[in-house]
């Protein structure tokens, strides 16, 4: 129920997928939630990031996210006046290049340190209710989201038999 | 090329139910969330319903809460709004307009010609 | 809920004048802000989308600015095709037209 039942259809589509530009067409700083109001939080270790599913304390402070929003166009035979076929990929970066990412083999989501251009696994796909309400599909794998599983995220795959409207991986985002 | 055509707008009394539909052509409908906005004679616009890819999440401005249903047949390519309850503040013209990205409720990339609809005794 | 609300509520201006249409929000929408084209008997189109992308086919003396709770819609050098209604349209959170502002051409 949430946008994401024409996924397995546009699978091949999806991989073929070209961000249109390079720069991305707005950047929103965020905090994280799961849909049950854990944040997600961000921890140094060892000269490496560690990705939290947690209840925070009371006056604890929410970690941010920079979501940059990217277009992508979907190769298609719609035509007409441009507006089709556009689909909005986002990159996720708690802190200055780092990048979360998709590890499709081990099912994990990951913080990497790169430079742009970003690979492929750094892109998800934005599926929304409202703008603070999202899903992120891996832009290497449809049908694959970023989840929760076990208090931790890792890539979860969402099935057209399962209740799409699965709450594990839908996020909140908020200002605060 | 991308089309909405609007249909089922009319004279209705109060009280009474009215239901449109916004058949859509030129894109691939599934994907996209669809929209009722309205606009009363000479005033601004104002958002109505939304209603999402698959038809599994719906919204509604609070005074049509109840009276109004918006739905979707991805089959037909169709959306509709099923209005009851209809007051006089309901006259307006009812457009559909389709989202600007696929699975995203930000925008309204296109839009129909819109249908009358006039609530009056 | 969010308030939208532009100004001024009727602006006059002659060919070729730079002018500039503003939208406040009652809160923070994070860009998250379109600009629509009502001409007299038309339907609704959009310009400007995400605050300051210009929608394919818009002539490109249209541009969008602004963050948090103030935005702005400014045509470089108005054009007599121009006249029109302008309404911003905020989706940060729910759905929210502005009441619009009516461009004539002196």
């Known amino acids: 129920a949430f946008g994401i039942s024409g996924v397995q259809k546009y699978t091949r589509a999806l991989h073929d997928s070209s961000i249109t530009g390079i720069s991305p067409i707005t950047e929103y700083l965020a905090s994280l939630s799961t849909y049950n109001d854990q944040s997600i939080t961000f921890a140094l270790e060892d000269e490496s990031y560690e990705i939290y599913v947690e209840d925070l304390k009371k006056d604890e402070k929410k970690d941010k996210v920079l979501l940059s929003y990217y277009e992508s166009q979907h190769p298609s035979n719609e035509s007409g006046d441009g507006v089709d076929g556009k689909m909005l990929m986002v990159t996720l970066s708690p802190t200055k290049d780092f990048w979360l990412h998709a590890n499709n083999k081990e099912h994990s989501v990951e913080l990497h340190k790169c430079e742009k251009p970003l690979p492929d696994q750094a892109f998800f796909v934005l599926h929304n209710m409202h703008s603070n309400c999202v899903s992120f599909e891996c832009k290497t794998d449809p049908g694959v989201f970023i989840g929760v599983k076990d208090n931790h995220l890792a890539l979860i795959k969402v099935d057209s038999s399962e209740n799409l409207c699965t709450e594990n991986i839908l996020f909140k985002l908020s200002e605060t | 090329e991308v089309q909405l055509v609007e249909t089922g707008g009319g004279l209705v009394q109060p009280g009474r139910s009215l239901k449109l539909s916004c058949v859509a052509s030129?894109?691939?409908?599934?994907?996209?969330?669809m929209y009722w906005i309205r606009q009363a004679p000479g005033m601004g616009l104002e958002w109505v319903s939304s209603?999402?890819?698959?038809?599994?999440?719906?919204y509604y401005l609070d005074s049509v809460k109840g009276r109004f249903t918006i739905s979707r047949n991805n089959a037909e390519n169709t959306v509709y709004l099923q209005m009851n309850s209809l007051r006089s503040e309901d006259t307006a013209t009812y457009y559909c307009?389709?989202?600007?990205?696929?699975?995203?409720?930000?925008?309204?990339?296109?839009w129909g010609q819109g249908t009358l609809v006039t609530v009056s005794s | 809920d969010i308030q939208m609300t532009q100004s001024p509520s009727v602006l006059s201006a002659s060919v070729g004048d730079r002018v500039t249409l503003s939208c406040k929000a009652s809160h923070n929408i994070n860009k998250h802000l379109d600009w629509y084209q009502q001409k007299v008997g038309e339907a609704p189109k959009l310009l400007i989308y995400?605050?300051?992308n210009l929608q394919t086919g818009i002539p490109s003396r249209f541009s969008g600015s602004g963050s948090g709770t103030d935005y702005t819609l400014t045509i470089s050098s108005l054009q007599p095709e121009d006249v029109a209604t302008y309404f911003c349209?905020?989706?940060?959170?729910?759905?929210?037209f502005g009441q619009g502002t009516k461009v004539e051409i002196k």
């Open positions: 030129g894109f691939t409908f599934s994907n996209y969330w």
């Open positions: 995400f605050t300051n």
């Open positions: 349209f905020q989706y940060n959170s729910g759905w929210t």
């Open positions: 307009a389709k989202g600007h990205y696929y699975y995203s409720s930000y925008s309204f990339g296109y």
């Open positions: 209603i999402n890819n698959d038809g599994g999440n719906t």
